[in-house]
């Protein structure tokens, strides 16, 4: 079993955290926009 076949669990964790951060930023931006538009 070559290491290259797999993405290791830490790399997957980092990607998940990056996605979470991105979504939080996008959703936060949308929320601020909605508040501003009211």
């Amino acid at each position: 079993h070559s290491d290259g076949i797999f993405t290791d669990s830490y790399s997957r964790y980092r990607k998940q955290m990056a996605v979470k951060k991105y979504l939080a930023a996008v959703l936060g931006k949308r929320y601020k926009q909605r508040v501003k538009n009211k």
Partner: antibody
Amino acid sequence: QSVEESGGRLVTPGTPLTLTCTASGIDLSSYAMIWVRQAPGEGLEYIGFIDAGDGNTYYASWAKGRFTISKTSTTVDLKITSPTTEDTATYFCARGDPGWSNGFALWGQGTLVTVSS
Amino acid sequence: DIVMTQTPASVSGAVGGTVTIKCQASQSIRNELSWYQQKPGQPPKLLIYKASTLASGVPSRFSGSGFGTEFTLTISGVQCDDAATYYCQNNYGTRRNNYVFPFGGGTEVVVK
């Protein structure tokens, strides 16, 4: 590059104690850090870890509520919330390389905590 | 939490001989397992990670194998300096296993 634990001492049961892991020559925000303990003559017991980048913490089931891991820009702290005599051990911190998947290559020498009345 | 079971608890090997230590995980951890050597009064030293990759500066007489739940550490051509306690550690972190990285109970290697 090194990590060093400090803060170990003799405490009475129930007295909270905070241990500190200080990193030299490394930016803690790039690494996963774990705390491990070893009672006299016993094996290694995993406590928990903090992703020093985002501050997320995770604990072994037995350690939840008994320990709190936190960080500053240069240190990672382990608080023993209400020590009992069973918490007498040498406490180690270790750094992932950079995460956990490649094991933990950098360890401190440990700090001894003795809990006794 | 994942449970790591190491066998035997103690093993004796002759200088120049071969010693084998086994580690079993309670669920699949793929190849994300490391091995450490610890001598009295010292912190653990990383020997092998990703089940079979030798850490920097570790002699080639140490080797690791395994995948999933069964893993082996082999010391070929045992030397006096190899007398120590050896630990395996899970390094497979997922939300499901709560990112917990436990150790096996340890194996004491006595060199004759």
